[in-house]
């Protein structure tokens, strides 16, 4: 039950997470104008990673979309790449944890695929987020970088030359959007790996009973299993989870990988 | 089409108020900034200052600040501007105006004359 | 606050002759975010409220004729009318929309010569 509950929660941690990490990255204020010297401007501008947008005192906003990829700086590209892949894993992640989820039942999968599922979506979800807070770091060291370097700056205008003070810019809404988001995923990836460990099949040492008339000898065989009667050789091969005693052909599995997680 | 009304002519004695209202119509009154302007005679354009549409908030210019009051009654699309302790120098033409794209001024009312005599 | 010069203070013109009109702000008006000027223009005559004719320094509001033009950028812009008409005959003003307070120019009188 804990497993279930840990599963689904993470599964919802990052969900919200991913969907956050979807916002950031489509919100255009990852840069504000910063207000400290003029707190009552008349043009207000903002800036996200896909467009820039201003906003007047009249409450027209007009935005332009950044129309060309070699012209954008290079820290800019990385982090559209960081956030973009960060999406991409979280979406896949989305899907994997899906099938992954205990209470959700697809045909006869077997507990440990769904172990392996709920790992590699797990993973996922952890990479997604870092990839969405190292994007947002980038973007924010970028920013006071700037904040501080931005003196003056020369535009050529129809009037020749003219001297203008630079805009300065700050932390936007979508920094603190997606750092929240990366770190909901991060945990929800975290709670997925640890939901995994409950889901793997345990390497557990039962005695083996055997149950068998007299003449008939119990044969020991190599591999793992514990014993086996003389009927011939043991094919079942599954699992079952009911608590109570185990005969000797519920086959004991080999550990997996996910046992040391 | 747009228009914005404003009242009559006014002359008042020093120390007295007035308040001078600007009536909208043609658009929704509460989308648009309404700005003030001032024009005493045979000078130049004044800006007193502005009200924020969404807020109601006003902002007013520094030699605005003080005796000038801008208000808003949304259920009647009218703005309006109080001057209390009028004084001579407060004699001029008043026009409301809404604040548009380019932080311009594109409709005007047609000005209302407050006079301040004794 | 921006302060807003215009020259000259008073202009006589010809009919049909060209008319120019500067002005000259203590700041820069151009926008960074969106490389625009936020400068305009206004014609006021007698007797009546001021009319808009050029925002963002050269884009023409919509039914003034196409005889008015406005260039420049940062702190220096022009209005220009290129064939002076009769009903052109008015007080011009140039306006900050940078940044609060709004401010005028003085006005620019546009006479017949």
């Known amino acids: 039950m804990a497993v279930t509950a840990c599963q689904g929660l993470g599964f919802v941690v990052s969900l919200i997470g991913i969907a956050g990490i979807i916002a950031a990255t489509c919100m255009d204020q990852w840069s504000t104008q910063d207000l400290y010297n003029n707190p009552v401007t008349a043009v207000f501008n903002y800036q996200g990673l896909w467009r820039s947008c201003v906003r007047e005192s009249s409450g027209f906003t007009e935005c332009r979309g950044y129309f060309t990829l070699l012209g954008l700086p290079a820290m800019l590209q990385a982090v559209r790449a960081l956030m973009i892949v960060g999406i991409v894993l979280g979406a896949i992640g989305l899907l994997v944890s899906i099938f992954a989820l205990k209470c959700i039942r697809i045909g006869s999968m077997e507990d440990s695929a769904k172990a392996n599922m709920t790992l590699t979506s797990g993973i996922m979800f952890i990479v997604s987020g870092l990839c969405a807070i190292a994007g947002v770091s980038v973007f924010a060291n970028m920013l006071v970088t700037n904040f501080w370097m931005s003196t003056a700056n020369m535009y050529t205008g129809m009037g020749g030359m003219v001297q203008t003070v630079q805009t300065r810019y700050t932390f936007g809404a979508a920094l603190f959007v997606g750092w929240v988001a990366g770190g909901l995923t991060l945990i929800g990836g975290v709670m997925m790996c640890i939901a995994c460990r409950g889901l793997a099949p345990e390497e557990t040492n039962y005695k083996a009973v055997s149950y068998h008339a007299s003449g008939h000898s119990v044969a020991y065989k190599p591999g793992g299993f514990k014993a086996s009667t003389g009927f011939g050789s043991n094919t079942k091969n599954k699992k079952i989870y009911d608590g109570g005693a185990r005969t000797e052909d519920e086959v004991q599995s080999y550990p997996s990988k996910h046992d040391y997680v | 089409q747009i228009q914005l009304v404003q009242s009559g002519s006014e002359l008042k004695k020093p120390g007295a108020s007035v308040k001078v209202s600007c009536k909208a119509s043609g658009y929704t009154l509460t989308n648009y900034g309404m700005n003030w302007v001032r024009q005493a005679p045979g000078q130049g354009l004044e800006w007193m200052g502005w009200i924020r549409p969404n807020t109601g908030e006003p902002t007013y210019a520094e030699d605005f600040k003080g005796r000038f009051v801008f208000s808003l009654d949304t259920s009647v699309a009218t703005a309006y501007l109080q001057i209390t302790s009028l004084k001579a120098e407060d004699t001029a033409v008043y026009y409301c105006?809404?604040?548009?794209?380019?932080?311009?001024?594109?409709?005007w009312g047609q000005g209302t004359l407050v006079t301040v005599s004794s | 606050d921006i302060v807003m010069t215009q020259s000259p203070d008073s202009l006589a013109v010809s009919l049909g002759e060209r008319a120019t009109i500067n002005c000259k702000s203590s700041q820069n008006l151009l926008n960074s975010g969106n490389q625009r000027n936020y400068l305009t223009w206004y014609q006021q005559k007698p007797g009546q409220p001021p009319k808009l004719l050029i925002y963002?320094?050269?884009t023409r509001e919509s039914g003034v004729p196409d005889r008015f033009s406005g260039s420049g950028s940062g702190t220096d812009f022009t209005l220009t009318i290129s064939s002076l008409q009769a009903e052109d005959l008015a007080v011009y003003y140039c306006q900050n929309g940078y940044s609060f307070p709004f401010t005028f120019g003085q006005g620019t009188k546009l006479e017949i010569k």
């Open positions: 963002w320094a050269s």
């Open positions: 105006a809404r604040l548009y794209r380019g932080n311009t001024l594109d409709n």
